[in-house]
Interface confidence: low
């Protein structure tokens, strides 16, 4: 942190404060966090910066800082001020920054702020302000930053803002505002950033944002909006829009038609059920679009003019088909997540040349054709789990040189094409009960993790015979750490000197890794030595029937022989 106070004895430096020249023949004075209950008296007329933050000052007298005509920044944050009288800042002609946050003010000190013509930044946040008088900012012609967040406002002080034409950034967050009326910010033509998050806003006037010609950032997160904020249509320069954590149920057609510059939209944590097909058209700067659980969407959105999208997540809807031209609209797509939909048939994704990750789990897909994923040279991860895939073309994966993760678990596969999959590190085929053939480890030289339908199929990956005993003892689950292992099995090594136990276990772990570098599940075990011999209920029932019949025949023979003799 900053160096401790040196209590420099300069003329005009109050006791215990830290003072230093500011390089312009003026003085910077830091009297923060000293437990002061009143303003220091012997301040130099040449003071340019005065920090009185985090003291116990509860009141200011009129004209408490006489003749500080060079003062540019005054910090009174974190005191106990409940009221600031008229004339408290008289004569501070150069004042640019005034910090009054973290006090106990109940309304904006209108009279005290009059004629601070040079003021550029005013901090009034973290007070108890419930009232902002209509003319309170009228003399603040240079004001650029206004902080009113974390107060007790219940409405937008429309009249008070009329005079702030130079304002660039304002926050009204963390208040109790419930409505924004038409033309609430009508004169704020220079405003670039407006924060309204963490209020109780439930309704917006149709023209509430009119006049905000320069606005680039609008934060409406954490409010009670139950309708899409259509009033944003006039914000032609809007780049960042947040309305997450509200109660919005639908996004209408052409929702962002007036906001062609949007780069980011945050709208998660809303109970969105419906989205108009044209809602996200013509947003050339948009990079990410995420929509989870919009259950009434039945058609894939029309994303004409939103060609720079890099990530599209549209999960938990009822989309049953994708347009054949989906990739023509989205040539820059890198991540596509359409999990938990009703997709049956897939188009060819080959025009989406930049795709790196596709997630299509939990759909109704029944077939993977030869051209579905053809020539996706950047594709690294493909998730097709929990579908109804019974047929995969032998060359479906033959042109995916970057593919390292493939999940086909819980489908209806009876065979599995290996062409082109030699780079895989993760392969999941569990839950395909008809897939009973063995897969050779030689086809997957890079494999680290494989999940198969049956334990015996892991034998090809070096986890059979003695290995399964160790595997079962030491690798009970993916997440069991060596720490758990030490606790569970340290008793096995009582003879081992305790000082060496840690080293021994670490060596043992290395030996284990060398023994089978492929993690295959389910692991073969004493009760699953060769499950394929007794696989399927028909075979099992047949064997049991034979045993029972054999037993009955033996019994009859025994009885027969007994009678005979």
């Amino acid at each position: 942190g900053s160096s401790p106070r040196s209590g420099v004895l300069l003329r005009g430096c109050p006791t215990h404060c830290h003072c230093e020249p500011d390089g312009r023949m003026l003085l910077r004075v830091d009297c923060s966090d000293l437990g002061l209950s009143e303003l220091p008296s012997n301040l130099s007329v040449f003071t340019s910066y005065l920090d009185l933050s985090m003291n116990n000052i509860s009141q200011l007298l009129p004209n408490p800082l006489p003749s500080l005509r060079f003062l540019e920044e005054l910090r009174l944050a974190g005191n106990a001020l409940t009221y600031i009288p008229k004339g408290a800042f008289t004569g501070l002609y150069s004042l640019k920054v005034l910090m009054l946050q973290n006090n106990q003010l109940r309304h904006v000190p209108t009279e005290a702020l009059q004629n601070l013509r040079s003021l550029q930044s005013l901090r009034l946040d973290a007070n108890h302000i419930s009232y902002v008088p209509p003319s309170c900012f009228s003399g603040l012609h240079s004001l650029r930053h206004l902080w009113l967040d974390d107060n007790a406002l219940t409405e937008i002080p429309v009249q008070a803002f009329r005079s702030l034409s130079a304002l660039q950034a304002m926050t009204l967050a963390l208040n109790k505002i419930h409505h924004i009326p038409d033309y609430a910010f009508g004169n704020l033509s220079s405003l670039v950033v407006l924060h309204l998050h963490n209020n109780r806003i439930h309704s917006l006037g149709k023209k509430c944002f009119d006049g905000l010609h320069s606005l680039e950032t609008l934060d409406l997160n954490y409010n009670n909006l139950d309708e899409f904020p259509t009033a944003i249509r006039t914000l032609s320069n809007l780049k960042e829009l947040g309305f997450h954590s509200n109660n919005i149920r639908s996004i209408p057609e052409k929702a962002f038609v007036g906001n062609p510059s949007l780069i980011t939209i945050h709208f998660y944590d809303n109970p969105i059920q419906f989205v108009g097909r044209s809602a996200f058209q013509h947003l050339p700067e948009l990079r990410t679009l995420t929509l989870n659980g919009a259950s009434q969407i039945t058609e894939f959105p029309d994303l004409t003019g939103t060609a720079n999208l890099e990530s599209l997540t549209l999960t938990g809807a009822q989309i049953s088909s994708l347009p054949q031209t989906v990739c023509n609209q989205l040539p820059n797509l890198q991540v596509l997540d359409l999990s938990y939909n009703l997709l049956e048939d897939l188009p060819s994704f080959s025009v989406c040349q930049k795709l790196q990750k596709i997630d299509l789990r939990h759909n109704e897909i029944y077939e993977i054709k030869v051209d579905t994923f053809q020539q996706l040279l950047s594709l690294r991860s493909l998730n097709l789990a929990w579908n109804k895939i019974a047929i995969i073309h032998p060359n479906a994966f033959s042109t995916l040189p970057s593919l390292i993760k493939l999940d086909l678990s819980s489908n209806l596969l009876s065979s599995f094409p290996i062409t082109g999959l030699h780079g895989l590190t993760h392969l999941k085929l569990t839950g395909n009960h008809a897939l009973q053939s063995l897969i050779s480890s030689e086809n997957f030289p890079e494999l680290k993790v494989i999940e198969m339908p049956y334990a015996y199929q892991c034998c090809a990956f070096g986890v059979c015979e003695n290995a399964y005993k160790i595997s079962n003892q030491w690798n009970k689950g993916d997440n069991s750490s060596m720490d758990d292992l030490h606790k569970k099995d340290a008793g096995m090594f009582q003879a081992q000197d305790e000082r060496d136990l840690e080293d021994f276990l670490l060596d043992f772990e290395e030996d284990l890794k060398a023994l089978h570098s492929v993690q295959c599940s389910p692991s073969p075990g004493p009760f699953k030595p060769c499950e394929h011999l007794l696989d399927g209920w028909l075979i099992r029932i047949g064997v049991m029937a034979l045993i029972v019949l054999g037993g009955v025949a033996g019994l009859l023979l025994f009885i027969g022989l007994g009678i005979f003799f």
């Epitope: 942190g1 944050a77 974190g78 973290n102 946040d125 974390d150 963390l174 963490n198 950032t217 960042e240």
Partner: antibody, heavy 121, light 112 residues
Framework: QVQLVQSGAEVKKPGSSVKVSCKAS????????IGWVRQAPGQGLEWMGG????????KYAQKFQGRVTITADESTSTAYMELSSLRSEDTAVYYC??????????????WGQGTLVTVSS | DIALTQPASVSGSPGQSITISCTGT?????????VHWYQQHPGKAPKLMIY???NRPSGVSNRFSGSKSGNTASLTISGLQAEDEADYYC???????????FGGGTKLTVLG
């Protein structure tokens, strides 16, 4: 004098989580936001997120969204940063720092001493 | 978020002045005065040298000054001293992402 004292160095395995604490001295903890910044070996500073203790609501860098959780306990003047699904590239010194003017755009005027987190299998 | 652009290294002799630049965009450096500068010696935590563009915290030498023009902020150190040798980082607030961004850092070497 404000002081931020962080918990000690940690060695973690890939896939696990780490929780670093930052205890503030002085009576002004709740009024200020606390940020977390990390620095990988030989690399620059990277902002992870921050929290305003008196509201308990946190803000995270997009890169860490979903993987980092920042909390604060006003009663003990302590902030916490938990990072999950650790990977080797998360090996870094993690700093907590105080936002000097209490809000997120302001500068970090006081810093903790840093906590080295090493992620290694 | 894209990091702010700083020169990787600068150097100067004792007594000289040097300037380190920090270039951003209209949404970070250009919009606000929320540009801050930090000094970091090896193995130590960063130390705030300039905040809000041009203000110095108590205890920081007046040899350090900050300024801004358009989308570029600058840190100037006059009368270079051996103890000024360190890494320097700029930081800004990005009004688009509501996030904080740092520059890549500049290594200052004091010659001789």
């Amino acid at each position: 004098q404000v002081q931020l004292v962080q918990s000690g160095a940690e060695v973690k395995k890939p896939g696990s989580s780490v929780k670093v604490s930052c205890k503030a001295s002085g009576r002004t903890f709740s009024n200020y936001a606390i940020g977390w910044v990390r620095q990988a070996p030989g690399q620059g500073l990277e902002w992870m997120g921050g929290i305003r203790p008196n509201f308990g609501w946190a803000k995270y860098a997009q890169k860490f969204q979903g993987r980092v959780t920042i909390t604060a306990d006003e009663s003990t003047s302590t902030a916490y940063m938990e990072l999950s699904s650790l990977r080797s590239e998360d090996t870094a010194v993690y700093y907590c720092a105080r936002y000097g003017q209490g809000h997120f755009p302001s500068a970090f005027d006081y810093w903790g001493q840093g906590t080295l987190v090493t992620v290694s299998s | 978020d894209i990091a702010l652009t700083q020169p990787a290294s600068v150097s100067g002799s004792p007594g000289q002045s040097i300037t380190i630049s920090c270039t951003g965009t209209n949404s970070d450096v250009g919009t606000y005065n929320y540009v801050h500068w930090y000094q970091q010696h090896p193995g130590k935590a960063p130390k705030l040298m300039i905040y809000d563009g041009s203000n110095r915290p108590s205890g920081v030498s007046n040899r350090f000054s900050g300024s801004k023009s358009g989308n570029t902020a600058s840190l100037t150190i006059s009368g270079l001293q051996a103890e000024d040798e360190a890494d320097y980082y700029c930081q800004a607030y990005d009004s688009h992402s509501f996030n904080i961004v740092f520059g890549g850092g500049t290594k200052l070497t004091v010659l001789g």
